[in-house]
């Protein structure tokens, strides 16, 4: 199956790479604008220059294009704990990230929130914290993993998953009590 091409892609595919078809005259191929610039006026004829203008402050284009407007720079989402890694330039969007010892949790394709990496208290680090993944902890004996934290088996209720992990501990406690001498 051949994927369906949009009108713009169809028009572009007629011209060699780095050029696009003139919107009013499909016999003319105009040179695309460099990154950091946008299309102000199409080329007047074959072999003539396309009128490209530099993006204004607060906007960018990251690749060669024939856009009529530059794209607005992204803003880092402070309410998501994001910080600016590098600011927007005419040819590159703002890069947002998280602080040291934090990882990104993606709520959707383009939206992430920063969370603190787990420290694995009462356990050991099985896998270190990554840019997009929290630390993976392994808990010490007598502790079980709940919401990526090692919690004491004394907090394990019968209805919870932890009963399997804490069973030996619970049995030991019972055994000690039962075998008590008077």
């Amino acid at each position: 199956l051949v994927p369906h091409l949009g009108d713009r892609e169809k028009r572009d595919s007629v011209c060699p790479q780095g050029k696009y078809i003139h919107p009013q005259n499909n016999s003319i191929c105009c040179t695309k604008c460099h990154k950091g610039t946008y299309l102000y006026n199409d080329c007047p004829g074959p072999g003539q220059d396309t009128d490209c203008r530099e993006c204004e402050s607060g906007s960018f284009t990251a690749s060669e294009n024939h856009l009529r407007h530059c794209l607005s720079c992204s803003k880092c989402r402070k309410e998501m704990g994001q910080v600016e890694i590098s600011s927007c330039t005419v040819d590159r969007d703002t890069v947002c990230g998280c602080r040291k010892n934090q990882y990104r949790h993606y709520w959707s394709e383009n939206l992430f929130q920063c969370f603190n990496c787990s420290l694995c208290l009462n356990g050991t680090v099985h896998l270190s914290c990554q840019e997009k993944q929290n630390t993976v902890c392994t808990c010490h004996a007598g502790f079980f993993l709940r919401e990526n934290e090692c919690v004491s088996c004394s907090n394990c209720k019968k209805s919870l998953e932890c009963t399997k992990l804490c069973l030996p501990q619970i049995e030991n406690v019972k055994g000690t009590e039962d075998s008590g001498t008077t």
């Epitope: 949790h105 959707s108 939206l111 919401e147 990526n148």
Partner: nanobody, 116 residues
Framework: EVQLLESGGGLVQPGGSLRLSCAAS????????MAWVRQAPGKGLEWVSF????????YYADSVKGRFTISRDNSKNTLYLQMNSLRAEDTAVYYC?????????WGQGTLVTVSS
């Protein structure tokens, strides 16, 4: 067929509490992050809170932080929003929504009115 049914709204005095529920069906609930979104009279939609698949990750809008708590019970296919210290500005229709990528499914909403 995907269905999201909100309940628990009503009239409450400032400073009061309400607990909203959203019963989900027609999809594997535990496979999706869920959200509460609200729309105040004559205003646009506002994110209230998100919750991740297992409930570990949560997000709250600054306007509700410290007052609202989102939770989920995957065994009951239900999303909750505990709302405490309610204010007049919390008056809105509250919707639960599935899949934060495209919000293709919404409930019909439940009205919360905070008034003395």
């Amino acid at each position: 067929e995907v269905q999201l049914l909100e309940s628990g709204g009503g009239l409450v005095q400032p400073g009061g509490s309400l607990r909203l529920s959203c019963a989900a069906s027609g999809f594997t609930f535990e496979d999706y992050p869920m959200a509460w979104v609200r729309q105040a009279p004559g205003k646009g939609l506002e994110w209230v809170s998100f919750i991740g698949l297992k409930g570990i990750h949560t997000y709250y809008a600054d306007s509700v932080k410290g007052r609202f708590t989102i939770s989920r019970d995957n065994s009951k296919n239900t999303l909750y929003l505990q709302m405490n210290s309610l204010r007049a500005e919390d008056t809105a229709v509250y919707y639960c929504a599935k899949d934060l990528n495209n919000f293709d499914y919404w409930g019909q909403g439940t009205l919360v009115t905070v008034s003395s």
